[in-house]
Interface confidence: low
């Protein structure tokens, strides 16, 4: 069968493969065509980095599927992960590493299960399937690690009309995340939302815990007037 391999520059190559071919075999075919050493290739399909020993059929890669090829940087790059206790961890990563990969590296170093990790960069919570490059995380960037509370907590958001919305959140959620949850529930674009707690307008990049917002706290939602 034929599959396609697309590069970051948009170039596409066509490969003749079998479902039983291993990822290693596919990398060898790419080397034959393009001269790229297999150890510098990373193949991505459906947001997952493909492992050498597995087969195309293991990943449900069918005819005319498109894989994405990114290159492994020689030596990669270093990023820093800072915890709420102030401890800083140094990780060797590559731009093509997924957030999932980064959490696995943190688990290797610190023993924290990935499902209890939340990584924050530039005020945004990072999603498992995305890569560091998706978030423009470059060498020597600092990510912030906060721990996911099991079960999280409920808070209430009260509108000027008196309606109360209940949200499932965690202390590590950013105000941006909360606005996104409100958008999911109510359809109000985040840029039109203003959240108030204890008389203070809450800033997007900060977390609920920054404002000491605890379980069953009530936030007030006011709408930002267009043009205002």
């Amino acid at each position: 069968m034929q599959i396609f391999v697309k590069t970051l520059t948009g170039k596409t190559i066509t490969l003749e493969v079998e479902p039983s071919d291993t990822i290693e075999n596919v990398k060898a075919k790419i080397q034959d065509k393009e001269g790229i050493p297999p150890d510098q290739q990373r193949l991505i399909f459906a947001g997952k980095q493909l492992e050498d020993g597995r087969t195309l059929s293991d990943y449900n890669i069918q005819k005319e599927s498109t894989l994405h090829l990114v290159l492994r940087l020689r030596g990669g790059m270093q990023i820093f992960v800072k915890t709420l206790t102030g401890k800083t961890i140094t990780l060797e990563v590559e731009p093509s590493d997924t957030i999932e990969n980064v959490k696995a590296k943190i688990q290797d170093k610190e023993g924290i299960p990935p499902d209890q990790q939340r990584l924050i960069f530039a005020g945004k919570q990072l999603e498992d399937g995305r890569t560091l490059s998706d978030y423009n995380i470059q060498k020597e960037s600092t990510l912030h690690l906060v721990l996911r509370l099991r079960g999280g907590m409920q808070i209430f958001v009260k509108t000027l009309t008196g309606k109360t919305i209940t949200l499932e959140v965690e202390p590590s959620d950013t105000i941006e995340n909360v606005k996104a949850k409100i958008q999911d529930k109510e359809g109000i674009p985040p840029d039109q939302q203003r959240l108030i707690f204890a008389g203070k307008q809450l800033e997007d990049g900060r977390t609920l815990s920054d404002y000491n917002i605890q379980k069953e706290s009530t936030l007030h939602l006011v709408l930002r007037l267009r043009g205002g």
Partner: antibody
Framework: EVQLVESGGGLVQPGGSLRLSCAAS????????IHWVRQAPGKGLEWVAS????????SYADSVKGRFTISADTSKNTAYLQMNSLRAEDTAVYYC???????????????WGQGTLVTVSS | DIQMTQSPSSLSASVGDRVTITCRAS??????VAWYQQKPGKAPKLLIY???SLYSGVPSRFSGSRSGTDFTLTISSLQPEDFATYYC?????????FGQGTKVEIK
């Protein structure tokens, strides 16, 4: 349509500095690579420097290392070559080119600018 | 650095001739060799990459081949617009290096 346009060349004295620009359109330089290649009058092609914004990776020919700096402003989709401590032997037409092969170590070059002449002379 | 030794440095040919230019790499470069055409006062144009892959929009009279560390550019039937200088380049490792060029002139 992919286009590369160089600017910033001119006459400079030995020891002087120049900054060349390479404005790209039709593709995103962040996900590509930009390279400077020069050609001395009547001579062949010589690679000078490369930048891969996605990787934060740069590399230089030994002949310019420590004197030239390649950089990119992805918001402007433009790459730059800062040339310091210029010598007579740096006199050449400087081309910027896009990397075609994705092998980051050394690609082929599929699109080239029109070139900008740098003359180093007293 | 990998040296690319190109030959001949110049050749004279007529329209319709078959022309062959060779390039030898000083060490293995796999199939990572490109060929360019350059006309006076103009930027080079990519013809072939990865030894034998024809770049998009390039006429099929141009072809490339590899035998170990020897690479060949062939123009099957020379056209008037093909009179130019041709360069090979290895795109296997940094620094990318070019051959010294072959000038194809009208006989």
């Amino acid at each position: 349509e992919v286009q590369l346009v160089e600017s910033g060349g001119g006459l400079v004295q030995p020891g002087g500095s120049l900054r060349l620009s390479c404005a790209a359109s039709g593709f995103n330089i962040y996900y590509s690579s930009i390279h400077w290649v020069r050609q001395a009058p009547g001579k062949g092609l010589e690679w000078v420097a490369s930048i891969y914004p996605y990787y934060g990776y740069t590399s230089y020919a030994d002949s310019v290392k420590g004197r030239f700096t390649i950089s990119a402003d992805t918001s402007k989709n433009t790459a730059y070559l800062q040339m310091n401590s210029l010598r007579a032997e740096d006199t050449a037409v400087y081309y910027c080119a896009r990397g075609y092969s994705w092998y980051y170590g050394s690609p082929a070059f599929d699109y080239w600018g029109q070139g900008t002449l740098v003359t180093v002379s007293s | 650095d990998i040296q690319m030794t190109q030959s001949p440095s110049s050749l004279s040919a007529s329209v319709g001739d078959r022309v062959t230019i060779t390039c030898r790499a000083s060490q293995s470069v796999s199939s990572a060799v490109a060929w360019y055409q350059q006309k006076p006062g103009k930027a080079p144009k990519l013809l072939i990459y990865s030894a034998s892959s024809l770049y998009s929009g390039v006429p099929s009279r141009f072809s490339g081949s590899r035998s170990g560390t020897d690479f060949t550019l062939t123009i099957s039937s020379l056209q008037p617009e093909d009179f130019a200088t041709y360069y090979c380049q290895q795109h296997y490792t940094t620094p990318p290096t070019f051959g010294q060029g072959t000038k194809v002139e009208i006989k």
